[in-house]
Amino acid sequence: PEPPTACREKQYLINSQCCSLCQPGQKLVSDCTEFTETECLPCGESEFLDTWNRETHCHQHKYCDPNLGLRVQQKGTSETDTICTCEEGWHCTSEACESCVLHRSCSPGFGVKQIATGVSDTICEPCPVGFFSNVSSAFEKCHPWTSCETKDLVVQQAGTNKTDVVCGPQDRLRA
């Protein structure tokens, strides 16, 4: 018979004949022959192959490097890779989450508009008139200036976007 030029799904062409691919989780040891089937072997510990394949080596599971702010979200199997995610307080640098960075803090004069998540960074906003932030924080919003009037006090020092007002006693009129 005429040697094949194309093979069925889950097969590959080698030496003018169609051999079965190895199933996910297994690697190729030897190609099939006229008389023998394709020989495959399961991937070892911490290895995987996620497709029907003719790979002679399995891939190492991804290492979730804590130096890059990563931790294991889902342990890999012989057919799937490990899935990494960010440590608490870190967020991914891209959709694929190959590394993470620490959430940014909002500087004094800025407050947190939106707290960071595992996929998005802190969003800061400048403290408007009447509000202040005197700390660098990834959580704190701008605080309103103290209302001296409600405490029966007067403003001795005006507030800024970085400092609260300073209240003091009212000057008493002498008799």
Epitope: D50, H57, H59, Q60, K62, N67, L68, G69, D81, T93, S94, E95, A96, E98, S99, V101, L102, H103, R104, D121
Partner: antibody, heavy 116, light 108 residues
Framework: EVTLKESGPVLVKPTETLTLTCTVS????????VSWIRQPPGKALEWLAG???????YYASWAKSRLTISRDTNLKQVVLTMTNMDPVDTATYYC??????????WGQGTLVTVSS | AFQLTQSPSSLSASVGDRVTITCQAS??????LAWYQQKPGKPPKLLIV???NLASGVPSRFSGSGSGTDFTLTISSLQPEDFATYYC??????????FGGGTKVEIK
């Protein structure tokens, strides 16, 4: 063993399009991204483009209009095309494992000269 | 556009010297900074990730510090094999994935 190997033309004429291929082994393109970084002779490294393990493409803002990055996970290849080549694009072009991240694994690089 | 400014561009030092290289980002990149060493004709080698964490197999004489916009690479006692060019790289986001201009460390 993880390897990355760049291939493509050694010489390109001005205004032509450069096509470079990075062939990887020892890891899956479904698990790791790949980036292209270049280095003109005697000059600094320049990040050009990256493709994430999810297939998302990223480009350096200064070269975005000239670049296209794509991948074939079955062939284990990542392809970069750069249009309208100029003599200032003469450089060693590297591919490295990773998208928007750090690059612990690099290819040996391929020198591309742009000259008429 | 986002920029990473590295200084000095070159320096001369002797074996045993303490060497410091700085890298400044034009906007905050949190801890998203790496350092590389490159020797002529070779691809760069990763030294530091996350601004201060030593990459696998890197000698402890190398250290990194900083966060936000200002970063430093220090070689505590320069060895003969450390004469090379050093680069910082930011990876905070796709719009800020950039290399610094490099610092060439030469023999005095």
């Amino acid at each position: 063993e993880v390897t990355l190997k760049e291939s493509g033309p050694v010489l390109v004429k001005p205004t032509e399009t450069l096509t470079l291929t990075c062939t990887v082994s020892g890891f899956s393109l479904s698990s790791y991204g790949v980036s292209w970084i270049r280095q003109p002779p005697g000059k600094a490294l320049e990040w050009l483009a990256g493709i994430g393990s999810d297939g998302s493409a990223y480009y350096a803002s200064w070269a975005k209009s000239r670049l296209t990055i794509s991948r074939d996970t079955n062939l284990k290849q990542v392809v970069l095309t750069m249009t309208n080549m100029d003599p200032v694009d003469t450089a060693t072009y590297y591919c490295a494992r990773g998208g928007i991240t750090v690059y612990a694994m690099w290819g040996q690089g391929t020198l591309v000269t742009v000259s008429s | 556009a986002f920029q990473l400014t590295q200084s000095p561009s070159s320096l001369s030092a002797s074996v045993g010297d303490r060497v410091t290289i700085t890298c400044q980002a034009s906007q905050s990149i949190s801890s998203g900074l790496a350092w590389y060493q490159q020797k002529p004709g070779k691809p760069p080698k990763l030294l530091i990730v996350g601004a201060s964490n030593l990459a696998s197999g890197v000698p402890s004489r190398f250290s990194g510090s900083g966060s936000g916009t200002d970063f430093t690479l220090t070689i505590s006692s320069l060895q003969p094999e450390d004469f090379a060019t050093y680069y910082c790289q930011s990876y905070f986001s796709s719009s800020s994935t950039v290399f610094g201009g490099g610092t060439k460390v030469e023999i005095k």
